[in-house]
Interface confidence: low
């Protein structure tokens, strides 16, 4: 599984090289699942993608997401996941030219086809949580995270640090 240890490896690499800028530091292909081991899957329908949160049978192939890691150009005032006060951010792309976007107006997580440079809505601050889990905080709306609401992904506001470990905003990254 690609959890805290994997992220920390890249965090150390960031610290060593002090890379900044708009190019990704590294890219990683992983399957994304919820804290409760439901898979996040993507299906092409009428030239746009649907996002599903569902139980997969053991023999069903998990969808992979390309995570591109960036170091924030602006120092973070908060300690925790940053490197020397800088934040680690990711974009998530399940297929060529499509990226997860935060639609803060609709409180939804959407897939949009777009060209680089990507808009801020496609960037998420990566938080290392417990039990090899990560969470994704909207760059455009601090305190709002990608989460699972019923059977779909949504944007969920986390109003206190104690709620950072609520299961519905925790995700697992896995190489398998």
């Amino acid at each position: 599984a690609f959890g805290i240890s994997g992220v920390q490896k890249y965090t150390r690499a960031l610290h060593d090289s002090s890379i900044t800028g708009i190019s990704p530091i590294t890219e990683y292909l992983a399957s994304l699942s919820t804290y409760n081991d439901q898979s996040i899957t993507f299906a092409l329908e009428d030239e746009s993608y649907e996002i599903y949160v569902e139980d997969l049978k053991k023999d069903e192939k998990k969808d992979k997401v390309l995570l591109s890691y960036y170091e924030s150009q602006h120092p973070s005032n908060e300690s925790g996941d940053g490197v020397d006060g800088k934040m680690l951010m990711v974009t998530l792309s399940p297929t060529k030219d499509f990226w997860l976007h935060a639609n803060n107006k609709e409180h939804s997580v959407e897939l949009h086809k777009c060209e680089k440079p990507l808009p801020d809505q496609a960037f998420f601050v990566l938080h290392n949580m417990h039990s090899n889990c990560v969470s994704f905080e909207c760059k455009t709306d601090p305190g709002v995270f990608i989460g699972v609401k019923d059977n779909h992904l949504a944007l969920i506001k986390v109003d206190s640090s104690e709620n950072l470990c609520t299961e519905n905003i925790l995700f697992k990254l896995s190489e398998t």
């Epitope: 009428d46 599903y52 897939l111 779909h152």
Partner: antibody, heavy 123, light 105 residues
Framework: EVQLVQSGAEVKKPGASVKVSCKAS????????IQWVRQAPGQGLEWMGE????????YYSEKFKGRVTMTTDTSTSTAYMELRSLRSDDTAVYYC????????????????WGQGTLVTVSS | DIQLTQSPSSVSASVGDRVTITCSAT?????MHWHQQKPGKAPKLLIY???NLASGVPSRFSGSGSGTDYTLTISSLQPEDFATYYC????????FGGGTKVEIK
């Protein structure tokens, strides 16, 4: 085969309440949004609200908030819609329906409909 | 909330005619869906995501459009196609157009 079978026609007096049931089969009831849509005689379709049986999460149209309650019984795969303080203009066919499983932008379409329940409100 | 306006509200046509129904949204939607309703029956999904035919729907039905303007076309009207057609769109929940009644001329 996906099926939504609704309860029979009802006649109610103004001020009364009605509770319409919708029994689902052919799919995992817990995993799909159930919609309630009504249609007054000779009129178009009007969305009332929806409920996700897996968690009981519900959303209601502003027009019906405070007057409608949607519930589910996952043990029997049945959805219920109760409308209170009935008026004559609530006379309509009430449909339960099931959304397509997808969610994401533009994923709100209804894929299956119940046969409808006629509710007549008359003194 | 998004409002959907269908036109025409009714159309008289003959078997074999080409019929076009339009649906206009007050703001851009990513796709449109269409339902068919026959008298005394429940609606039935006809087209989803703008142009995809629902299971069992004949190929004479087609859908197109983007942004705020969408179209349902019946290329050659058949006797069983006389019905009312509703467009449906929206993000968080379905919104319906006012309906278009296709009648026999």
């Amino acid at each position: 085969e996906v099926q939504l079978v609704q309860s029979g026609a009802e006649v109610k007096k103004p001020g009364a309440s009605v509770k319409v049931s919708c029994k689902a089969s052919g799919f995992n009831f817990k995993n799909y949004w159930i919609q309630w849509v009504r249609q007054a005689p000779g009129q178009g379709l009007e969305w009332m609200g929806e409920i996700f049986p897996g968690t009981g999460t519900s959303y209601y149209s502003e027009k019906f908030k405070g007057r409608v309650t949607m519930t589910t019984d996952t043990s029997t795969s049945t959805a219920y819609m109760e409308l209170r303080s009935l008026r004559s203009d609530d006379t309509a066919v009430y449909y339960c329906a099931r959304k397509h499983r997808g969610y994401g932008y533009g994923g709100a379409w209804i894929a299956y409909w119940g046969q409808g329940t006629l509710v007549t409100v008359s003194s | 909330d998004i409002q959907l306006t269908q036109s025409p509200s009714s159309v008289s046509a003959s078997v074999g005619d080409r019929v076009t129904i339009t649906c206009s949204a007050t703001s851009s939607v990513s796709s449109m869906h269409w339902h068919q309703q026959k008298p005394g029956k429940a609606p039935k999904l006809l087209i989803y995501r703008t142009s995809n035919l629902a299971s069992g729907v004949p190929s004479r039905f087609s859908g197109s459009g983007s942004g705020t303007d969408y179209t349902l076309t019946i290329s050659s009207l058949q006797p069983e196609d006389f019905a009312t057609y509703y467009c449906s769109g929206g993000y968080s929940h379905p919104t319906f157009g006012g309906g278009t009644k296709v009648e026999i001329k």
